[in-house]
């Protein structure tokens, strides 16, 4: 419904004055001599949120960011002469802006920064539990960035550390040209994509990376990478923008002649996000901005949830689509893709394809091969000539959950929470901006589960300036959000049932999962409680049915549009 | 020095069985793909099979499949070639062969396998 | 199937010559190409590995060029015990096959 998706109102729209007013929201607005506040880390274990920034890493309580611990890891003032004598800006660039911090083992988190255009990484001890409040530093340690961080404070890492070695997909090198996907630290020799061929990376914009598992064997674990690319010349007519989603073998050490210390199992595939235009022509939403994966009671089966934003200047949108990974293994399954033809198109490989398929993660489930060191090299050759799927990877239901075309903002971040509600499980997505504000948005099932309406339940404004929303993390345990900035980082509670009314229709009408008329106010719903007291409905909004006290006198018509 | 020694060769009426061997030695047997291939009286270099390094998986060209299986026992450092259903066709010395993930780079000095009625 | 074609099938030269032996590929295949020499009565032995790799023990007059589907071996000086068939294989894709070979022969 895609009238109801770009013209959806808000329920509540919250300014950042009423936000903190009502309490809504706790604001860390950052120190003098930092900025940057991109890269989240959430502990829930020790009630932690790790945030690198520009030449400082904070530990803040999960509870009141207000108490919070810092590092301050600037780079020498050598390396800062250095990087300002190589043209580069002394305040925007040439300092240590925290790319990746993620947890190394159960006592310490590693860190890589920019480093002045000179990339570094540490360990940060952080303890074994939570009242030993260590957080700090290991400066006698320190280890070269490259293939970790970016050189350039603008670029971002999508990385992944598991089993003691870090996976990122980053630019390599000082000019940032050279993007590839990179395994290093651990013990075995590092792994990357072909370098300088286009087929495999053209310039990417790296947005996260994944660990999904492919069976019960953890031989074939996957990683899968986000990012978004330049099409391929003859892909698409003109310069365009595809979003990507690529995998890896987590057990892949390279070929043996060919492709040595580079990925063998290397593929990826196109995101589909778009909507049918009036004139034929699809409309598509291209610019990869986000992705967050929801986990489901099949470890192998998250829903992928992305955001998209149009790559037109003329027509600014942004759009919210699901895939399952059932129809992305599909894709990887499928035909490559594959130039031929007297202009040169890409089309789908029709020729032989050699065992064991590439892409295939070697291991006992498939047939006795080892080590991708093992493999024939007619595998290695087709892997190093066909990185790409023929077909793309269309979401669920074939278009967006959510679409926002008339606005004068953009989607930048996305978190989900799947809540139990009265009438069954709803995802609600928090969607942030580049104007520093977060949609609280419900995926509400019409006639079939298929069939999703959004129900727009709050426009909140987090941040005292319009900033650009870089990084989200929601905390189930404290039921709490996370938002980082340029500026800064806000905390805010998942639900506000109170400001929903006084009166049982306001409350079912707001059709919000987290909250319920408990017979006296409009409270948090929690689904062991006394169900029948509780009042809520969520696919329909409809009081008359659920509120028996007749209470629907609290003026349905109002919007309760706060200015 | 890597030595493969073949045997099991022989006379053997078309439709007959004959199951060839190759002892290995000089090199660690179980860490290479070992390949079989042909060579008819007067004739040219036929590739037959290569099996990978942990025995799991092999590779036959059409002439062959389903009538010849490579197999291996990393244990005893032997490849074996297993013919069923023989042609006169067939008929040529079997080199065991050290490769076939890549070049083939030792071979044995062959077996000959005769068939004929 | 990749079909190989060696020329010329039959080469006649004397020792100290130059030798040059050819082999064409039925498509591109990169540099997965490998030369084997066959004495009467012998098996074959490892020449050059992927179009231009040397093998250890081979001798340095033995070279190998080329890639795509055109390559090459040379022999800078032939020695009288160089005379035999040569044999090109390329390794790109299964089935692997043979070239029908080229024989060199005392002039």
């Known amino acids: 419904n895609y009238a109801n998706g770009k013209n959806n109102v808000p329920r509540l729209k919250l300014s950042y004055k009423e936000m903190l007013e009502s309490n809504n929201v706790i604001t860390f607005n950052g120190l003098a001599n930092s900025s940057s506040y991109h890269t989240f880390l959430l502990d829930e274990e020790r009630s932690r949120l790790y945030v690198g920034a520009k030449d400082h890493i904070f530990s803040f309580n999960l509870v009141n960011i207000k108490d919070f611990q810092k590092i301050v890891w600037p780079v020498s003032y050598t390396r800062r002469d250095e990087c300002k004598w190589a043209g580069k800006d002394i305040l925007k660039e040439c300092a240590n802006f925290i790319k990746v911090l993620k947890a190394y083992n159960q006592t310490h988190l590693y860190a890589c920064g920019t480093g002045a255009f000179h990339p570094i990484c540490t360990y940060i001890e952080v303890g074994h539990h939570p009242e030993d409040n260590i957080f700090k530093l290991q400066d006698s340690h320190f280890e070269n960035g490259r293939g970790k961080s970016p050189y350039d404070p603008k670029l971002l890492t999508a990385s992944l550390l598991i089993d003691g070695e870090l996976y990122s997909g980053t630019a390599a090198d000082f000019m940032g040209r050279d993007f590839a996907i990179f395994r290093t630290l651990g013990h075995h020799h590092p792994i990357r994509t072909e370098q300088h061929d286009s087929r495999w990376l053209n310039d990417p914009r790296f947005i996260s990376a994944h660990l999904i598992p492919e069976s019960d064997n953890p031989e074939d674990d996957k990683v899968y990478f986000f990012f978004r690319e330049n099409a391929i010349d003859g892909e698409h007519s003109g310069k365009a923008t595809h979003a990507r989603i690529g995998q890896i073998c987590k057990n892949d050490f390279g070929g043996h002649r060919s492709l040595v210390n580079k990925w063998t199992t290397f593929l990826k595939a196109r995101l589909i996000c778009s909507v049918p235009g009036p004139n034929g022509i699809d409309t598509h939403f291209d610019e990869l901005q986000d992705v967050f994966l929801m986990n489901s009671k099949d470890p192998k089966n998250p829903i992928v949830y992305g955001v998209f934003t149009t790559s037109s200047n003329i027509f600014k949108g942004s759009a919210v689509c699901m895939y399952s990974m059932s129809d992305v293994r599909r894709v990887f399954l499928g035909p490559y893709a594959h130039r031929d033809g007297p202009n040169y198109q890409w089309v789908p490989y029709q020729g032989r394809v050699p065992y064991p398929r590439p892409g295939t993660c070697p291991s006992k489930t498939f047939g006795g091969f080892d080590s991708t060191k093992d493999l024939p090299d007619d595998v290695i050759t087709f892997a190093r000539s066909h990185p790409a799927m023929y077909n793309p990877v269309f979401p669920i239901n074939n278009r967006p959950i959510m679409i926002k075309t008339d606005v004068n903002y953009q989607f930048t971040q996305i978190v989900v929470d799947r809540v139990d509600a009265e009438d069954g499980q709803y995802d609600v997505m928090f969607i942030g901006t580049d104007v520093g504000t977060v949609l609280k948005v419900v995926s509400v099932p019409k006639e079939t589960w298929h069939d999703l309406e959004e129900v727009l339940l709050e426009e909140m404004t987090v941040f005292r300036e319009p900033t650009t929303i870089s990084a989200m993390e929601l905390s189930t345990k404290q039921q709490q959000l996370y938002i980082g900035s340029t500026a800064g980082v806000a905390q805010l509670p998942l639900h506000r049932c109170d400001i929903y009314g006084k009166a049982c229709a306001e409350c079912c009408l707001a059709r919000d999962p987290y909250c319920a008329w408990d017979g006296s106010s409009c409270s948090r719903y929690f689904p062991t409680a006394k169900a029948r007291t509780r009042a809520q409905d969520i696919r329909n909004g409809d009081p008359l049915t659920h509120c028996s006290d007749g209470g629907i006198e609290g003026r349905m018509d109002h919007h309760h549009h706060h200015h | 020095e890597v030595q493969l020694v073949e045997s099991g060769g022989g006379l053997v009426q078309p439709g007959g069985s004959l199951r060839l061997s190759c002892a290995a030695s000089g090199f660690t047997f179980s860490s290479y793909y070992m390949s079989w291939v042909r060579q008819a009286p007067g004739k040219g270099l036929e590739w037959v099979s290569t099996i990978i390094k942990s025995g799991g998986y092999a590779y036959y060209p059409d002439s062959v499949k389903d009538r010849f299986t490579i197999s291996r026992d990393n244990s005893k450092n032997t490849l074996y070639l297993q013919m069923s259903s023989l042609r006169a066709e067939d008929t040529a010395v079997y080199y065991c062969?050290?490769?076939?993930?890549?070049?083939?780079?030792?071979w044995g000095q062959g077996t000959t396998v005769t068939v004929s009625s | 199937e990749i079909v190989l074609t060696q020329s010329p099938a039959t080469l006649s030269l004397s020792p100290g010559e130059r030798a040059t032996l050819s082999c064409r590929a039925s498509?591109?295949?990169?540099?997965?190409l490998h030369w084997y020499q066959q004495k009467p009565g012998q098996a074959p032995r490892l020449l050059i590995k992927?179009?231009?790799q040397s093998i250890s023990g081979i001798p340095a007059r033995f070279s190998g060029s080329g890639s795509g589907t055109d390559f090459t071996l040379t022999i800078t000086s032939l020695e009288p015990e160089d005379f035999a068939v040569y044999y090109c294989?390329?390794?790109?894709?299964?089935?692997?096959?043979f070239g029908g070979g080229t024989k060199l022969e005392i002039k």
């Open positions: 294989q390329q390794g790109y894709s299964f089935p692997y096959t």
């Open positions: 992927y179009a231009s």
């Open positions: 498509q591109s295949i990169g540099d997965y």
């Open positions: 062969v050290r490769g076939g993930q890549g070049a083939m780079d030792y």
